[in-house]
């Protein structure tokens, strides 16, 4: 990895061992200076593998609300608007980091947690399982 | 929102104002107890809107490595394996939280940051703009 010289103005840290506890400023900085401002807002409906978004809420997590995609069909929508079962709709998943209150119900103490979320769906050619 | 009683065993916190600084344990807990264990590993190639994954590395960010999807084509792959430009490949984007070292180069002090990443691509019917 790349070694970066430590800034002498860093806050003091007692324990250098893992599991390490760090200070995090929750005042979120939004870096979404996206060159393509159009977001995936209507793709869920226009996709050949359409999906619905479900709200997943957990007050012990930060962010407390996460939207989960569920593919509408096992097949994909063809040019006629019908479901074509020769193709498969599959979820596109991503591991994301969230903060989990630890100990529970604590407003200022968290643990980093990795969760798998489904962001949308895509249409794929099926895997053909050949029987010997 | 849901109000949860504060746990009396919480670490003490000086400043209750935003921007609030919290303690975060970086020993990641992995909650991926997924009922559908098959992950999106080969979907990027099998999709009718295939994509390539590009490594985005930033040592001032946690996680330092993020993979970004870029759609291979403007159109979608049809049943013959050719690109059909009557359909559009579009990126599915998601806002995720990362930790940004602040002040820079500090190992134990971060600020929460929201970034937009492309996770994969999906094939959509184009929006037809009618000229008046």
């Amino acid at each position: 990895g790349i070694t970066i010289p430590r800034n002498p103005g860093c806050p003091n840290s007692e324990d250098k061992n893992f599991p390490r506890t760090v200070m995090v400023n929750l005042n979120i900085h939004n870096r979404n200076t996206n060159t393509n401002p159009k977001r995936s807002s209507d793709y869920y409906n226009r996709s050949t593998s359409p999906w619905n978004l479900h709200r997943n809420e957990d007050p012990e997590r930060y962010p407390s609300v996460i939207w989960e995609a569920k593919c509408r069909h096992l097949g994909c929508i063809n040019a006629d608007g019908n479901v074509d079962y020769h193709m498969n709709s599959v979820p596109i998943q991503q591991e994301i980091l969230v903060l989990r209150r630890e100990p529970p119900h604590c407003p200022n103490s968290f643990r980093l947690e990795k969760i798998l979320v489904s962001v949308g769906c895509t249409c794929v050619t099926p895997i053909v399982h050949h029987v010997a | 929102g849901i109000t949860i009683p504060r746990n009396p065993g919480c670490p003490n916190s000086e400043d209750k104002n935003f921007p609030r600084t919290v303690m975060v344990n970086l020993n990641i807990h992995n909650r991926n107890t997924n009922t559908n264990p098959k992950r999106s590993s080969d979907y990027y190639n099998r999709s009718t809107s295939p994509w390539n994954l590009h490594r985005n590395e930033d040592p001032e960010r946690y996680p330092s490595v993020i993979w970004e999807a870029k759609c291979r084509h403007l159109g979608c792959i049809n049943a013959d394996g050719n690109v059909d430009y009557h359909m559009n490949s579009v990126p599915i984007q998601q806002e995720i939280l990362v930790l940004r070292r602040e002040p820079p180069h500090c190992p134990n002090s971060f600020r929460l940051e929201k970034i937009l990443v492309s996770v994969g691509c999906t094939c959509v019917t184009p929006i037809v703009h009618h000229v008046a």
Epitope: N45, N52, L53, H54, R55, N56, E68, A69, K70, C71, R72, H73, L74, G75, V83, Y85, N88, S89, V90, P91, Q93, L116, S118, C121, V124, P126, I127, V128, H129 | T33, N34, T35, N36, K38
Partner: antibody, heavy 124, light 113 residues
Framework: QVQLQESGPGLVKPSETLSLTCTVS????????VSWIRQPPGKGLEWIGI???????DYNSAFKSRVTISVDTSKNQFSLKLSSVTAADTAVYYC??????????????????WGQGTLVTVSS | DIVMTQSPLSLPVTPGEPASISCKSS????????????LAWYLQKPGQSPQLLIY???TRQSGVPDRFSGSGSGTDFTLKISRVEAEDVGVYYC?????????FGQGTKVEIK
Amino acid sequence: QVQLQESGPGLVKPSETLSLTCTVSGFSLPSHSVSWIRQPPGKGLEWIGIIWNNGGTDYNSAFKSRVTISVDTSKNQFSLKLSSVTAADTAVYYCARNFYITDYYYENYFMDAWGQGTLVTVSS
Amino acid sequence: DIVMTQSPLSLPVTPGEPASISCKSSQSLLFSENQKNYLAWYLQKPGQSPQLLIYWTSTRQSGVPDRFSGSGSGTDFTLKISRVEAEDVGVYYCQQSYYTPYTFGQGTKVEIK
């Protein structure tokens, strides 16, 4: 607990529109999808269509041209409208909640809670 | 549309004895991406609405007694009751949730001998 209750006129004249309401309680509308199913007297079950949590719909193509399913979230109510009815539409009509499974990334089309059903007779 | 064919259509049973119902689909219900079979079983007791017993061929819905079990793959499926009880009488339906429209079998009436 989860409850679904169908209501509407028990008698509809041929060529008219059958209108039913399904009032639900005990679960969150934004999470769950609801299907309508019917059962002609002495016969089996027939899926009519579904309304997803976002208000989108999918219908059995056998009914597509004459069916509409909608939701009024403020009243916790779903509705079914079936136009141009004939005697063949005489049936017990059920609304049912589609099973929601966390950490499973497809909509489900099996139903884990059903209303008690309402009999609709089409006759002049 | 996918045709679901159940047999037998009528099944007289003796309490304490096993019972078995067959369901055949006109197309495979196995989804290659997750190896799940999209078949569910319901029981409609006399005068009641259907209740979900089993989904994904063999997963019992919560609260369903373990005397009920499901098996099969592709196009051939079976519901077994290891020891029939009086409360198990009614009409059993299989349903495929793979292809739209989502279709049911014609039902198997289970009654006490």
